[in-house]
Interface confidence: medium
């Protein structure tokens, strides 16, 4: 005979666990239904009645199947200088990220408390390590035979063009100038760019069943430019 399908709430067999999207209620000592994302447990189950779920209120959410008594609060509104990369809905938290060209310099579990502009490498210096969501650009002096003539948070040092006859030798901040009409070899025109940091933020998850920790959200502190560092400018 096929096994009967149990309807929640039901007492599990000794040593067995509750099924997917069910949880074991210690008080009722029964397997009971979890609430779907976007809902929370309004009334916990008993031996005779199943969990009663209710929709999350505005500005609150649950992302997973759960039995939390209240939905989690969405993080603070984004500041005017931030980008809201994920809106607050009943099923997901708001995510605010530092705007392009900025990175998070001071963070807490709730997210970024201080966004700062990415360092710009001045002429004679190129990007050694590109900025990310949480780290600044690292600049390095252009090595002999290379140059950078820009103030940029993305440009690397480029090789000097090789001339048949050099009119003006190149240096760290200027390309070589050739006398002949065309150099023997030159780089493709235009600056070489490193890609801007791309968000690698993982999908935020909410603990189940413990609702005490919320997923992180990023925040911005409007601020002035950073002071120049060696080989960099705060502009």
């Amino acid at each position: 005979l096929p096994a009967q399908v149990a309807f929640t709430p039901y007492a599990p067999e000794p040593g067995s666990t509750c099924r997917l999207r069910e949880y074991y209620d210690q008080t009722a000592q029964m397997c009971c239904s979890k609430c779907s994302p976007g809902q929370h447990a309004k009334v916990f189950c008993t031996k005779t009645s199943d969990t009663v779920c209710d929709s999350c209120e505005d500005s609150t959410y649950t992302q997973l199947w759960n039995w939390v008594p209240e939905c989690l609060s969405c993080g603070s509104r984004c500041s005017s200088d931030q980008v809201e990369t994920q809106a607050c809905t009943r099923e997901q938290n708001r995510i605010c990220t530092c705007r392009p060209g900025w990175y998070c310099a001071l963070s807490k579990q709730e997210g970024c408390r201080l966004c700062a502009p990415l360092r710009k490498c001045r002429p004679g210096f190129g990007v050694a390590r590109p900025g990310t969501e949480t780290s600044d650009v690292v600049c390095k002096p252009c090595a002999p035979g290379t140059f950078s003539n820009t103030t940029s948070s993305t440009d690397i040092c480029r090789p000097h063009q090789i001339c048949n006859v050099v009119a003006i030798p190149g240096n760290a901040s200027m390309d070589a100038v050739c006398t002949s009409t065309s150099p023997t070899r030159s780089m493709a025109p235009g600056a070489v760019h490193l890609p801007q940091p791309v968000s690698t933020r993982s999908q935020h998850t909410q603990p189940t069943p413990e609702p005490s920790t919320a997923p992180s959200t990023s925040f911005l502190l409007p601020m002035g430019p950073s002071p120049p560092a060696e080989g960099s400018t705060g502009d």
Partner: antibody
């Protein structure tokens, strides 16, 4: 306007616990931190920790870890600070203060303070 | 922990004169061009009141005779022209990292 109103003075015996409340109004309670700072009579200010009411996340000063518990009730916009295993040196005025998540990152509004006296 | 040391411990200044309070941190409280140092005023029987945030920003409603300066480890609160109502204890505080810490306080009186 932003207001933080704290519960009244308490007298406790050594070894007991005290729970101080801080009711917030005039802003979105879940958006900013509530910090707790204490001040013994004639002494300076000492930061005990903070809670982010939106999530319930807490950050405690190591000095008070194990003795302090910060909680909140979002529905009534109230934060709580409970200090256990009280000793005479815990006699102090306890303040709650709001600290914005971003912007100032300083405690820009304070409660009126709650005097806790620990005496046998 | 970051230790903040204020100097002097107390200060007596004539009305209308300049008062200067210093605060030195045991390590830098700067991060990406911002100084996470703040100044508070506390009068007897009252909670502290924020005067200056992030080293040099005047809190709304605070008279402009108060100003803050400094970066890294050394910070200054200046009262350009002391008024009778400025008699209080002044505290510096850092929020660069947990645990947040306060200076021991500087008492300002009228000479």
């Amino acid at each position: 306007q932003v207001q933080l109103v704290q519960s009244g003075a308490e007298v406790k015996k050594p070894g007991a616990s005290v729970k101080v409340s801080c009711k917030a109004s005039g802003y979105t309670f879940t958006d900013d931190y509530i910090d707790w700072v204490r001040q013994a009579t004639g002494q300076g200010l000492e930061w005990m920790g903070e809670i982010y009411p939106g999530s319930g996340n807490t950050y405690y000063n190591e000095k008070f870890k194990g003795r302090v518990t910060m909680t909140r009730n979002k529905s009534i916009s109230t934060a709580y600070m409970e200090l256990s295993s009280l000793r005479s040196e815990d006699t102090a005025v306890y303040y709650c203060a709001r600290s914005q998540v971003y912007g100032k990152i300083a405690m820009d509004h304070w409660g009126q303070g709650t005097l806790v006296t620990v005496s046998s | 922990d970051i230790v903040l040391t204020q100097s002097p411990d107390s200060l007596a200044v004539s009305l209308g004169e300049r008062a200067t309070i210093n605060c030195r941190a045991s390590e830098s409280v700067d991060n990406s061009g911002n100084s996470f140092m703040h100044w508070y005023q506390q009068k007897p029987g009252q909670p502290p009141k924020l005067l200056i945030y992030r080293a040099s920003n005047l809190e709304s409603g605070v008279p402009d005779r108060f100003s803050g300066s400094g970066s890294g480890t050394d910070f200054t609160l200046t009262i350009s022209s002391l008024q009778a109502e400025d008699v209080a204890v002044y505290y510096c505080q850092q929020s660069k990292e947990d645990p947040y810490t306060f200076g021991q306080g500087t008492k300002v009186e009228i000479k």
